[in-house]
């Protein structure tokens, strides 16, 4: 009886062992398949993300091109209109000039004295920039770079005056602390008579002969 039970127990052990082994194999196989599926899903996800990103970039590029095309078209039609006109007013900003709030601006890259810069702007049928508001100041600052830059403000004839006749006393001002100091010690027969934007955008008065950059401004015809 004992030996019979022993035999059955042995058989059961073997059966169970075989069952465990086969189950382990199947679990491993399933696990491996699951991993493959996961990897495939991840791969598909990343492919999808890349395609989305590429599409988004293409869309942005396209938008930029469309915007540039519209801008070029507007500029071209404007230049044609200007050719038909008598040239007394700017119907659009010339090439390499920037438009802001109805005015055209040209930012120099070289340096000239204030009188030379003033003359340059006049020859371009413009004037050295006149700053009328905080917003215009920000626009100029954004485009001028970290370099001293002449503006159309001078006190060479006495009180501070804007070159286009804008009233200085009631207008926008952005002087550095303790400026203008109109320092007379330089022996030039007058004070520091010309105003410029400093590298941080705030204003300073300086000797007019300094070779600084400058900004020209011209009014655009408001009818267009």
């Amino acid at each position: 009886q004992n030996s019979k039970l022993r035999g059955e127990l042995q058989a059961l052990r073997e059966t169970f062992s075989n069952f465990t082994a086969s189950t382990e194999v199947e679990v491993k196989a399933l696990s491996s398949q699951g991993g493959n599926v996961g990897r495939k899903m991840k791969s598909l996800e990343s492919q999808l993300e890349k395609q989305q990103k590429d599409l988004s970039e293409d869309h942005s590029d396209l938008l930029l091109h469309v915007k540039q095309f519209v801008s070029d078209l507007r500029s071209l039609s404007c230049q044609i209109a200007a050719l038909h006109g008598n040239g007394s007013t700017l119907t659009c900003c010339p090439v390499n000039w920037l438009e802001y709030e109805g005015s055209c601006y040209w930012f120099s890259r070289s340096g000239k004295s204030w009188p030379e810069a003033d003359k340059y702007c006049q020859l371009e049928s413009a004037h050295l920039v006149v700053v009328n508001s905080r917003e215009e100041q920000k626009f100029i600052q954004h485009h001028m770079g970290p370099v001293n830059t002449w503006m159309g403000l001078t006190d060479q004839s006495g009180p501070w005056k804007w070159v286009d006749g804008t009233d200085y006393e009631t207008g926008f001002k952005n002087w550095r602390p303790e400026q203008p100091d109109d320092w007379y010690g330089h022996g030039l027969g007058g004070g520091e008579d010309c105003a410029h934007f400093t590298d941080d955008g705030r204003w300073n008065d300086d000797v007019c002969q300094r070779p600084y950059r400058w900004v020209c401004e011209a009014a655009r015809d408001p009818a267009t």
């Epitope: 890259r109 340096g111 970290p146 030039l188 000797v207 070779p211």
Partner: antibody, heavy 120, light 107 residues
Framework: QVQLVESGGGVVQPGRSLKLSCAAS????????MHWVRQAPGKGLEWVAV????????NYADSVKGRFTISRDNSKNTLCLQMNSLRAEDTAVYYC?????????????WGQGTTVTVSS | DIQMAQSPSSLSASVGDRVTITCRTS??????LAWFQQKPGKAPKSLLY???SLQGGVPSKFSGSGSGTDFTLTISSLQPEDFATYYC?????????FGGGTKVEIK
């Protein structure tokens, strides 16, 4: 530390060309104007040319205008002086010097110099 | 161009002496003036800028003053290492111009 090292000097015949270089290190080259200054044997200092920090503005002494060209490569921290149609009076030690600012604020750091001799 | 007249062209002095060099410009240059020191066979060294501001690392025995057209460089107590040639330079406008130099020699 801030350093400027000139190279490219030598003996050259009148009418020929030479290119000087100045390697800058120890500071952010692209934010400073750069100058060339020369000194003839036994003479004083003579300013030659300036180039602004971004390369947009260049100015020259009348004595070299039309013959010399100043240039810079901010990606390589290098200043150059291309000298054409050289004359005997161009014989000098050539120094590169850093502007204190973008290009109109005077000189603060000088290189050791490179000698140019124009002779037939 | 702005002309620079430096005087004297040379001077003899003893260690411990107070030395003054002057520089006069042909037109007003504000304070846009620098001073340099040069020793034989060496590159110039910047001493002062904006007429009176000391460059970093330059001893306070060097001082500058003036504005407009008349400027001075003063060495309060001359030391052996100060025997050299000194140049003024204007940088108000291009072309930058140098004075002819002042050679400070040992008496």
């Amino acid at each position: 530390q801030v350093q400027l090292v000139e190279s490219g000097g030598g003996v050259v015949q009148p009418g020929r060309s030479l290119k000087l270089s100045c390697a800058a290190s120890g500071f952010t080259f692209s934010t400073y104007g750069m100058h060339w200054v020369r000194q003839a044997p036994g003479k004083g200092l003579e300013w030659v040319a300036v180039i602004w920090y971004d390369g947009t503005n260049k100015n020259y002494a009348d004595s070299v205008k039309g013959r010399f060209t100043i240039s810079r490569d901010n990606s390589k921290n290098t200043l150059c002086l291309q000298m054409n149609s050289l004359r005997a009076e161009d014989t000098a030690v050539y120094y590169c010097a850093r502007d204190q600012g973008v290009g109109y604020d005077g000189l603060d750091v000088w290189g050791q110099g490179t000698t140019v001799t124009v002779s037939s | 161009d702005i002309q620079m007249a430096q005087s004297p062209s040379s001077l003899s002095a003893s260690v411990g002496d107070r030395v003054t060099i002057t520089c006069r410009t042909s037109q007003g240059i504000g304070k846009y003036l620098a001073w340099f020191q040069q020793k034989p066979g060496k590159a110039p060294k910047s001493l002062l800028y904006k007429a009176s501001s000391l460059q970093g690392g330059v001893p306070s025995k060097f001082s500058g003053s003036g504005s407009g057209t008349d400027f001075t460089l003063t060495i309060s107590s001359l030391q052996p290492e100060d025997f050299a040639t000194y140049y003024c330079q204007q940088y108000m406008t291009y072309p930058l111009t140098f004075g002819g130099g002042t050679k400070v020699e040992i008496k």
